[in-house]
Interface confidence: medium
């Protein structure tokens, strides 16, 4: 897998550490497939940023499917203590708020938010899942918190 050594950093809300997507398939929606077996599997939920249980039908589906909770965590998360937190002391917007939206070069498109310096608003855009820049937030609230006046 050519993505084996790549880490895709995504800025997340201030309650949680930044999300690092190791593979773009971690952003896929849980897919039980068309078959009717009842198999307990795990998938990575980009909204809760946690590995969660789902029932897999036994065929097809996608790569966001793991035999164990541990495997899911290993493939889709890596904690990092560095956070971007807007404090009362930090009155100025960080420089990255003025960067243009950048989808990056990957193709695992997921929805993110960026601060649009033209409209002075946080807006939605498609993020490819890797590279790009720090003007990239998982939640609208965090984008507003950090970059809007």
């Amino acid at each position: 897998d050519s993505e084996e050594d790549e880490e895709h950093t995504i800025i997340t809300d201030t309650e949680l550490p930044p999300l690092k997507l190791m593979h773009s398939f971690c952003a896929f929606k849980a897919d039980d497939g068309p078959c009717k077996a009842i198999m307990k599997r795990f998938f990575f939920n980009i909204f809760t940023r946690q590995c969660e249980e789902f029932i897999y039908g036994g065929c097809e589906g996608n790569q966001n499917r793991f035999e164990s909770l541990e495997e899911c965590k290993k493939m889709c998360t890596r904690d990092n203590a560095n956070r971007i937190i807007k404090t009362t002391l930090q009155q100025e917007k960080p420089d990255f708020c003025f960067l243009e939206e950048d989808p990056g070069i990957c193709r695992g498109y997921i929805t993110r938010y960026f601060y649009n310096n033209q409209t002075k608003q946080c807006e939605r855009f498609k993020y490819g899942g890797c590279l790009g820049n720090m003007n990239n937030f998982e939640t609208l609230e965090e984008c507003k918190n950090i970059c809007e006046d």
Epitope: K29, E101, P103, Y109, I110, T111, F114, E123, R124, F125, K126, G128, T139, L140, E141
Partner: antibody, heavy 119, light 107 residues
Framework: EVLLQQSGPELVKPGSSVKIPCKAS????????MDWVKQSHGKSLEWIGD????????IYNRKFKGKATLTVDKSSSTAYMELRSLTSEDTAVYYC????????????WGQGTLVTVSA | DIVMTQSHKFMSTSVGDRVSITCKAS??????VAWYQQKPGQSPKLLIY???TRHTGVPVRFTGSGSGTDYTLTIISVQAEDLALYYC?????????FGGGTKLEIK
């Protein structure tokens, strides 16, 4: 089956307000944002904004900021759009619409509510 | 805002013909383009999203293509029921924007 049910036509006076409901069924209401789209007679479609029913967070097209207010009632799985300070320019069909999971097109639309602003 | 331009307001075609409706974005929208069909008195109907992914139940005669700023909806063999307005829409970034529409008329 996903259904978005809108109310019937509204005839309102200039300067007044109107609140349009959109009742969702056939899916978990809080799992998807609800979008609103305007279509003036014989014209194209304009995205007004959307609201995340799980937390009430909304994004507006700046053209409609101050004109439209989006709200939800989770208990009845209903989204609302209030339009205020109405003028003849606001005469249009207003649709609620729901996207796919990852914000990739609108497969589900309400039937539209015609709002006519006239003295 | 991203401007979506459909240069042809009207297109005339015959049943069985192949027709292509074009749409140009004012910036690269990384294939985040949807196409809709709208008939009089009806809500728009999603045909294509991600530029080329056909929505469930859409006839195979509808195909989408394109990348960067240029996108095309092709109807391989036009049927009488395809008489309608067709809109493109970018779902790359908010505010989502639609093209002005192309009305397909059957000769």
């Amino acid at each position: 089956e996903v259904l978005l049910q809108q109310s019937g036509p509204e005839l309102v006076k200039p300067g007044s307000s109107v609140k349009i409901p959109c009742k969702a069924s056939g899916y978990t209401f809080t799992d998807y944002t609800m979008d609103w789209v305007k279509q003036s007679h014989g014209k194209s479609l304009e995205w007004i904004g959307d609201i995340n029913p799980s937390n009430g967070g909304s994004i507006y097209n700046r053209k409609f900021k101050g004109k439209a207010t989006l709200t939800v009632d989770k208990s009845s799985s209903t989204a609302y759009m209030e339009l205020r300070s109405l003028t003849s320019e606001d005469t249009a069909v207003y649709y609620c619409a729901r996207m796919h999971y990852n914000y990739d097109g609108f497969p589900y639309w309400g039937q539209g509510t015609l709002v006519t602003v006239s003295a | 805002d991203i401007v979506m331009t459909q240069s042809h307001k009207f297109m005339s075609t015959s049943v069985g013909d192949r027709v292509s409706i074009t749409c140009k974005a004012s910036q690269d929208v990384i294939t985040a383009v949807a196409w809709y069909q709208q008939k009089p008195g009806q809500s728009p109907k999603l045909l294509i999203y991600w530029a080329s992914t056909r929505h469930t139940g859409v006839p195979v005669r509808f195909t989408g293509s394109g990348s960067g700023t240029d996108y095309t909806l092709t109807i391989i063999s036009v049927q009488a029921e395809d008489l309608a307005l067709y809109y493109c829409q970018q779902h790359y970034s908010t505010p989502y924007t639609f093209g002005g529409g192309t009305k397909l008329e059957i000769k």
